[in-house]
């Protein structure tokens, strides 16, 4: 580990003296002197600072722009930034969630492996043998082919990854 520095945790070194950092939610007004403590002021409305700091300006809360498909997931405080998420049916394009795009739909032949959230897109998977999907959907999983046998029917047309099997009546001429 790094050896300890001249000033303790939650202090900073300025002009040969250790001054207290401002606590989260407050900004620096003036450094300490030999005779006075560090002077800090609370951040204003719609501003924040999330660490012990010596910043002279607070950061502006993030704006969740509805024109970009964004909405507020968690309102910011003087110590935390606003957290944005996307409107229903949309998801963030990046971790910072600065804009949103429509959830992807899984094409016929593919089913939904994982439904999209506000921060992640739909994950599709190809329908394996025995399963199909005949729609473009952001919710539908691959469905199993119909089991003709359980209905006392026989397969008249084989299923594919996009179509179900077609069942028909048993051939009565067979013993």
């Amino acid at each position: 580990p790094e050896p300890p520095t001249a000033c303790r945790e939650k202090q900073y070194l300025i002009n040969s003296q250790c001054c207290s950092l401002c606590q989260p939610g407050q900004k620096l007004v003036s450094d300490c002197t030999e005779f006075t403590e560090t002077e800090c002021l609370p951040c204003g409305e719609s501003e924040f600072l999330d660490t012990w700091n010596r910043e002279t300006h607070c950061h502006q809360h993030k704006y969740c722009d509805p024109n970009l498909g964004l909405r507020v997931q968690q309102k910011g405080t003087s110590e935390t930034d606003t957290i944005c998420t996307c409107e229903e049916g949309w998801h963030c394009t990046s971790e910072a969630c600065e804009s949103c795009v429509l959830h992807r739909s899984c094409s016929p032949g593919f089913g939904v492996k994982q439904i999209a959230t506000g921060v992640s897109d739909t994950i599709c998977e190809p329908c394996p043998v025995g399963f199909f999907s005949n729609v473009s959907s952001a919710f539908e999983k691959c469905h199993p082919w119909t089991s003709c046998e359980t209905k006392d029917l026989v397969v008249q047309q084989a299923g594919t990854n996009k179509t179900d099997v077609v069942c028909g009546p048993q051939d009565r001429l067979r013993a």
Partner: antibody, heavy 116, light 107 residues
């Protein structure tokens, strides 16, 4: 009144070490940083490092970091600067100074001569 | 490292003259600039800290001004006892650095 009294002049061989002391009086030793500065003959001032006598934590000038060690003994209100692997270019007057909004009070200086 | 350029490196003035020394920083150091006096065979003394604050016991003929990168040190009326070398020093960012010094002499 604030006083910083340093140890006497030293003559050292290249490759050896020197330890300069700085005894503080007239104030609460743990409440102020102690800075160390040197001045080669006919040259300007060069900062060596700073120590917090209260915590023992320190910062160093990268140029000299690997060879300088700053310590402080609260029981005797004395700060120390040790410099190892001495070379001729380390010949200088070494000063301690009290911090607190600049180097507010200085010791009288200790001449260290490095010569074979 | 922050460089401090002090000028002039030396000057000669008469007793009673107004003497001005400048110190320029290579980057913004706000008001974290200190001025020191070094007389031969004497302890170095802090004259001004935070660019313009007179240290205790320092005569009022010494003054300082400036902020950011450009600073000025002034002796309003030079006295024989002011013969010395003067240094500026920044306390904004480690490593602390000094100007090259200005040697003041009497004409």
């Amino acid at each position: 009144q604030v006083q910083l009294v340093q140890s006497g002049a030293e003559v050292k061989k290249p490759g050896s070490s020197v330890k300069v002391s700085c005894k503080a009086s007239g104030y609460a030793f743990s409440d102020y940083l102690i800075e160390w500065v040197r001045q080669a003959p006919g040259q300007g001032l060069e900062w060596i490092g700073v120590i917090n006598p209260g915590s023992g934590g320190s910062n160093y000038n990268e140029k000299i970091k690997d060879r300088a060690t700053l310590t402080a003994d609260k029981s005797t209100s004395t700060a120390y600067m040790e410099l190892s692997s001495l070379r001729s270019e380390d010949t200088a007057v070494y000063y301690c100074a009290r911090g607190g909004g600049g180097f507010t009070y200085w010791g009288q200086g200790t001449l260290v001569t490095v010569s074979s | 490292d922050i460089q401090l350029t002090q000028s002039p490196s030396s000057l000669s003035a008469s007793v009673g003259d107004r003497v001005t020394i400048t110190c320029r920083a290579s980057q913004d150091i706000s008001n974290y600039l200190n001025w020191y006096q070094q007389k031969p065979g004497k302890t170095i003394k802090l004259l001004l800290n935070f660019a313009s604050r007179l240290h205790s016991g320092v005569p009022s003929r010494f003054s300082g001004s400036g902020s950011g990168t450009d600073f000025t040190f002034t002796i309003s009326s030079l006295q024989p006892e002011d013969i010395a070398t003067y240094y500026c020093q920044q306390g904004s960012t480690l490593p602390w650095t000094f100007g090259g010094g200005t040697k003041v002499e009497i004409k």
